[in-house]
Interface confidence: low
């Protein structure tokens, strides 16, 4: 399910330039070894481990750069509004593409907390080179964060890092039809860590959704609901404090 | 500056129970699990569990499960460790350790606690 | 669980020496290895966090490499106030293991 991409390969300018075909706008290197640009701790937050995981626990306000922290990331209070009617996206003095979607944005939720769990509503549904971030952090002692990209009552992708099933830090990825679990694809690379800031980016692509944390690819997930269109919504639910979720168009 | 300091020793008679205290101070207590760490006379050391200070929940190893329990007094910054039906090979010192930044870590330790069981 | 196996089980050195101690892992713990220091009577202290990152106040004379299986610490230059028994421990998954001890001695 992971393959061994690094954003740092794609945009390093060695060899080739952008490896597996990534967009030139998926991410940013983060400041310093595992840092976040605008935090004071490059890469350790103090914390407390959920249990199984990542012993360490943040004290509130512990990622001093949130909301702006995170290129890329809509600056605080950045909300273009609300779509104006079926399927459009309008930009607030900016030029929109051909289709549903503008080439930029971001559009959703405003920066700042949010309310844990969060829909974000995805009107026109997903489409290809659709680029959804989500920012927030990490809970003192975090069990489970879960992001739903939902058709209906269908769950076309399940995105379910879990702190602690039978000792060990693990993602389950899945897909529900008709009340059905599938098959789960499970990735043991674990990028979160209890009381930590996170960026999570999910890449839609025409066959798969690509997710990235942190600025480095983590994953990918085949499409098994294939009307992308039908996708409207993205629940963001879990032991995290939200600090926004927007999409645009890359 | 961060301590952890634990109560006193203890000599107790098989059978009885021990309650061993950890007063934290010098951070935010809730921000960092407590681990308790066994080690007998001479032995290495042994991780019992930990304690989710935030919530409270206590997680054991399996050696440690069913005579031993956490606990929070969280208004006064300690953890506790409870052994109940002391048996001679409970003797050891037990230390508090907290959890630091990073994974599995533990950055501060108690001065540990003996705990003598003798008949 | 995972079985941590430090060698050599004791050590003699003499002093300005640089010497190393090995921790091998059952499985592969990525790099969440922490070393510590305990010193005859004394508490547990923590020398190095995530294979190779120091500790606060611990001296640059200490040193952790590895990830995977395989890790070691080395001190250079021993000092005297270095003689201590050295564990490690993994942070990977529960539950969290130490290895046997390494005791240090000086020649």
């Known amino acids: 399910m992971a393959d061994n991409f690094s954003l740092h390969d794609a945009l390093s300018g060695s060899g080739n330039p952008n490896p597996q075909g990534w967009p030139g706008a998926w991410g940013n290197q983060p400041a310093g070894a595992g840092g976040y640009p605008g935090a004071s701790y490059p890469g350790a937050y103090p914390g407390q481990a959920p249990p199984g995981a990542y012993p360490g626990q943040a004290p509130p306000g512990a990622y001093p750069g949130a909301p702006g922290a995170y290129p890329g990331a809509p600056a605080p209070g950045v909300y273009p509004g609300p779509p104006s009617g079926p399927g459009a996206y309008p930009s607030s003095g900016q030029p929109s593409a051909t289709g549903a979607y503008p080439a930029t944005g971001p559009y959703g939720a405003p920066a700042g907390p949010l309310i844990v769990p969060y829909n974000l509503p995805l009107p026109g549904g997903v489409v290809p080179r659709m680029l959804i971030t989500i920012l927030g952090t990490v809970k003192p002692n975090a069990n489970r964060i879960a992001l739903d990209f939902q058709r209906g009552n269908d769950v076309a992708f399940h995105f379910n890092p879990r702190f602690n099933e039978n000792n060990r830090r693990v993602i389950v990825c899945n897909t529900k039809l008709d009340n059905n679990w599938g098959r789960e694809e499970r990735q043991s690379v674990f990028p979160f860590e209890s009381g930590k800031p996170f960026k999570i980016q999910v890449l839609v692509e025409p066959d798969h959704f690509k997710v990235a944390v942190n600025d480095a690819h983590l994953l990918q997930y085949n499409h098994r609901v294939k009307k992308l269109n039908e996708i409207s919504k993205l629940g963001i639910s879990g032991d995290i404090d939200l600090t926004s979720a927007s999409y645009t168009m890359i | 500056q961060i301590q952890l300091v634990q109560s006193g020793p203890e000599v107790k008679k098989p059978g009885e129970t021990v309650k061993i205290s950890c007063k934290a101070s010098g951070y935010i207590f809730t921000n960092y699990g407590m681990n308790w760490v066994k080690q007998a006379p001479g032995k290495g050391l042994k991780w019992m569990g930990w304690i989710n200070t935030y919530t409270g929940e206590p997680t054991y190893t399996d050696d440690f499960k069913g005579r031993f329990a956490f606990s929070l007094e969280t208004s006064a910054s300690t953890a506790y460790l409870q052994i109940n039906n002391l048996k001679n090979e409970d003797t050891a010192t037990y230390f508090c350790a907290k959890f630091g930044n990073y994974v599995g870590a533990m950055d501060y330790w108690g001065q540990g606690t003996s705990v003598t069981v003798s008949s | 669980d995972i079985r941590m196996t430090q060698s050599p089980s004791s050590l003699s050195a003499s002093l300005g020496d640089t010497i190393t101690i090995t921790c091998h892992a059952s499985?592969?713990?990525?790099?969440?290895l922490s070393w510590y220091q305990q010193k005859p009577g004394n508490i547990p202290k923590l020398l190095i966090y995530k294979a190779s990152n120091l500790h606060t106040g611990v001296p640059s004379r200490f040193s952790g490499s590895g990830s995977g299986t395989g890790f070691t610490l080395t001190i250079s230059s021993l000092q005297p106030e270095d003689i201590a028994t050295y564990y490690c421990q993994q942070g990977q998954s529960y539950p969290y293991t130490f290895g046997g001890g390494t005791k240090l001695e000086l020649k």
């Open positions: 499985q592969n713990i990525n790099v969440w």
